[in-house]
């Protein structure tokens, strides 16, 4: 349902759903320029907006555009549809809440009087309400029963900060110290699971926060307990260092699993595998890229692009890679739809030079690059070796890989195998005599 999509998108982008809308029902053949012009004509007179993304929706076989508004949705002026190519396009917004209007009017009135929502809450006996949230544009808390027993949400002891980077910045804690404080404070908080989770996320930065966001995107009802378990699994010391690396090396896509879904599943395992290893961000990115190339069946176009990045030594970071893969998946969806529409005619992107190049490169012979292990420069033999890695970085940074050196290792190349075929080989297995197999020496990058 479009509304669910809007809500999910807002959650994923940490956006106020009252400042967002979705335009659905955009014909597949609509170009970006046509979309931009139509949206501009329909929305520009109302308020400033930003287009944050486009996607293909299978259920209505059309494109959708996600838009952030400069102001909260004005239900009186916002059209339910805008005229566009192929008919009218539906404008999806969060349903109007009758209380919102009252609260926003009350807010303006109080501002004129030099008062705030906090004063109202005190007058009503809601002394437990969080000061900072009371003066927001709309305060859902005010709707709760006015005479609840005081909660600890007004003033609460904030958690220390944990980022999951190998060398914590000033003001950040080690995982053990952070976890100790969380375990101590959590039981004291007499608040809802949602609020607990919000406070937990508030204390996270960098890779730790990225991982939580990924987990939340996959399961928005994830509990605080589950969040902590995931963090313990990744950053805790319980599992043997090598075991986590082996687990990462063993991970292959499931039958029919999309590349983007596999990447989401792989990321926490990669972060755990590289945690505490003296490696650069760029090396983590290189490992991720090489693992995908070795293990995943993908379209020649995507493989061509990823191999180009690999050859150039410019591995994308997690978010960049995800964007690239999702773009490609969307493109494939679009292409499939167009093919269904017009059947044998037309040369899709399949005939392009880019794809031809990509196809040529899939079967290209493997280049063997010498790599060093973590602590030792002598190469050793292992099946399915990975490049070594150094300190990890924020996954959400706006910068792309910014030039640290990275070690490399040979990765067996995954031919464009049919979905469901296990990677080229599981780590430690014999390579069969199929195409692409061959005896090869891999450095042992994980060895310490």
């Amino acid at each position: 349902m479009a509304l669910t999509l809007l809500e999910d998108w807002c959650k994923g982008m940490d956006m106020d759903p009252r400042k967002a809308l979705l335009i659905v029902g955009i014909p597949m053949e609509c170009s970006e320029v046509e979309i931009q012009d139509t949206v501009k004509a329909g929305l520009q007179p109302l308020c400033a907006y930003r287009v944050l993304g486009r996607m293909f929706r299978r259920e209505d076989n059309a494109k959708a555009v996600f838009i952030e508004l400069a102001d909260t949705v004005n239900y009186t002026t916002l059209p339910s549809h805008i005229p566009g190519k192929g008919g009218s396009w539906e404008v999806v917004v969060k349903p109007r809440n009758p209380d919102d209007e009252f609260l926003s009017r009350l807010n303006y009135f109080l501002k004129d009087e030099g008062r705030s929502m906090t004063d109202v809450a005190r007058a009503l006996g809601c002394c437990s309400l969080p000061a900072e949230s009371l003066d927001a544009e709309v305060m859902p808390q005010v709707r709760s029963p006015p005479l609840e027993p005081p909660k600890e949400s007004m003033w609460y002891r904030k958690l220390k900060v944990f980022s999951g980077t190998a060398s914590p910045s000033p003001g950040e804690e080690t995982f053990e110290d952070w976890l100790e404080q969380v375990t101590e404070i959590m039981p004291i908080w007499q608040v809802s699971e949602v609020e607990k989770r919000r406070r937990l996320l508030e204390s996270l930065r960098g890779p730790a926060l990225s991982i939580m966001r990924v987990l939340q995107a996959n399961n928005d009802s994830i509990t605080v307990e589950q969040c902590l378990d995931a963090l313990k699994q990744i950053f805790g010391d319980k599992e043997d260092f090598r075991a986590s690396q082996f687990r990462f090396l063993q991970t292959s896509p499931k039958i029919g699993e999309k590349v983007s879904t596999f990447l989401l599943r792989l990321e926490p395992l990669l972060q755990k595998a590289v945690h505490k290893s003296p490696l650069s961000v760029r090396s983590t990115d290189m490992i991720r890229l090489k693992h995908l190339l070795a293990r995943v069946a993908m379209t020649p176009a995507l493989r061509g692009k990823l191999e180009l990045l690999d050859q150039r030594g410019c591995p994308p970071n997690f978010l960049e890679l995800m964007k690239l893969i999702r773009d490609e998946e969307e493109w494939e969806n679009t292409e499939a739809v167009m093919k269904n529409k017009e059947k044998p005619s037309g040369r899709g992107r399949g005939a392009s030079g880019r794809q031809a190049r990509a196809e040529a490169s899939v079967s290209a012979p493997q280049a063997t690059v010498q790599a060093r292990s973590f602590s030792d420069s002598s190469p050793q033999t292992i099946q399915g070796g990975l490049p070594p890695l150094v300190k990890r970085r924020r996954l959400l940074g706006s910068e792309s890989t910014r030039g640290e050196d990275h070690g490399q290792a040979t990765y067996p190349k995954a031919e464009n195998q049919t979905p469901g075929r296990e990677g080229p080989q599981a780590a430690g297995e014999e390579l069969g005599n199929e195409a692409g197999a061959g005896a090869m020496s891999h450095p042992k990058p994980w060895e310490t």
Epitope: Q44, R50, E68, A70, D71
Partner: antibody, heavy 121, light 108 residues
Framework: QVQLQESGPGLVKPSETLSLTCTVS????????WSWIRQPPGKGLEWIGY???????NYNPSLKSRVTISVDTSKNQFSLKLRSVTAADTAVYYC???????????????WGQGTLVTVSS | DIQMTQSPSTLSASVGDRVTITCRAS??????LAWYQQTPGKAPKLLIY???SLESGVPSRFSGSGSGTEFTLTISSLQPDDFATYYC??????????FGQGTKVEIK
């Protein structure tokens, strides 16, 4: 480190077409959007337009009728063509990496050093 | 199009001064604003995005604030490297990306 380098003639005759190329190194052109921005001598900045690796473009309406931006992913390059130039198009032309669609904003985080193009007969 | 107006056009200050530059948008743009610094003969350099987020590697003496139509860039203690021209840029999709006309910070 991502680096951008503009190249092309520094002198163009009025009514002709200005052509510039931007070469991206240290990163793939296939992930971000890429923009052209210009700055007439002693004046402010003007955004010309952007392109994505797929070929999607968006141009400033004030220049739309005269501008074409194209991309060559195999060379990690994108190009600008501005037709029917006049002296008013004399400017330093910059190429830049564009974060269009990023939740944090559509800004320019890496720039080329710029190339001065003079329109004169 | 959304117009961006910066003030002042020129500002004379000394090393160590606290400097504030204002940028006003012709319509509400939430926090969709970036600030750049440009020194003569060089390309602009991103300082701030989303009105108040500091770009990595930019000294913490630079800060941005504001939302809606009024925005400010503040340099808490002016350093010799900071004498330059500063531009604001809005990024609403409802208008082409537009820049302010610039504010030149010069030595008093």
């Amino acid at each position: 480190q991502v680096q951008l380098q503009e190249s092309g003639p520094g002198l163009v005759k009025p009514s002709e077409t200005l052509s510039l190329t931007c070469t991206v190194s240290g990163g793939s052109i296939s992930i971000y959007y890429w923009s052209w921005i210009r700055q007439p001598p002693g004046k402010g900045l003007e955004w010309i337009g952007y392109i994505y690796y797929s070929g999607s473009t968006n141009y400033n309406p004030s220049l739309k009728s005269r501008v074409t931006i194209s991309v060559d992913t195999s060379k990690n390059q994108f190009s600008l063509k501005l037709r029917s130039v006049t002296a008013a198009d004399t400017a330093v032309y910059y190429c830049a990496r564009d974060t269009y669609g990023d939740p944090r904003g559509d800004y320019f985080d890496y720039w080329g050093q710029g190339t001065l193009v003079t329109v004169s007969s | 199009d959304i117009q961006m107006t910066q003030s002042p056009s020129t500002l004379s200050a000394s090393v160590g001064d606290r400097v504030t530059i204002t940028c006003r948008a012709s319509q509400r743009i939430s926090n969709w604003l970036a600030w750049y610094q440009q020194t003569p003969g060089k390309a602009p350099k991103l300082l701030i995005y989303k009105a108040s987020s500091l770009e990595s590697g930019v000294p913490s003496r630079f800060s941005g604030s504001g939302s809606g139509t009024e925005f400010t860039l503040t340099i808490s203690s002016l350093q010799p490297d900071d004498f330059a021209t500063y531009y604001c840029q809005q990024y609403s999709s409802s208008s082409p990306r537009t820049f302010g006309q610039g504010t030149k910070v010069e030595i008093k």
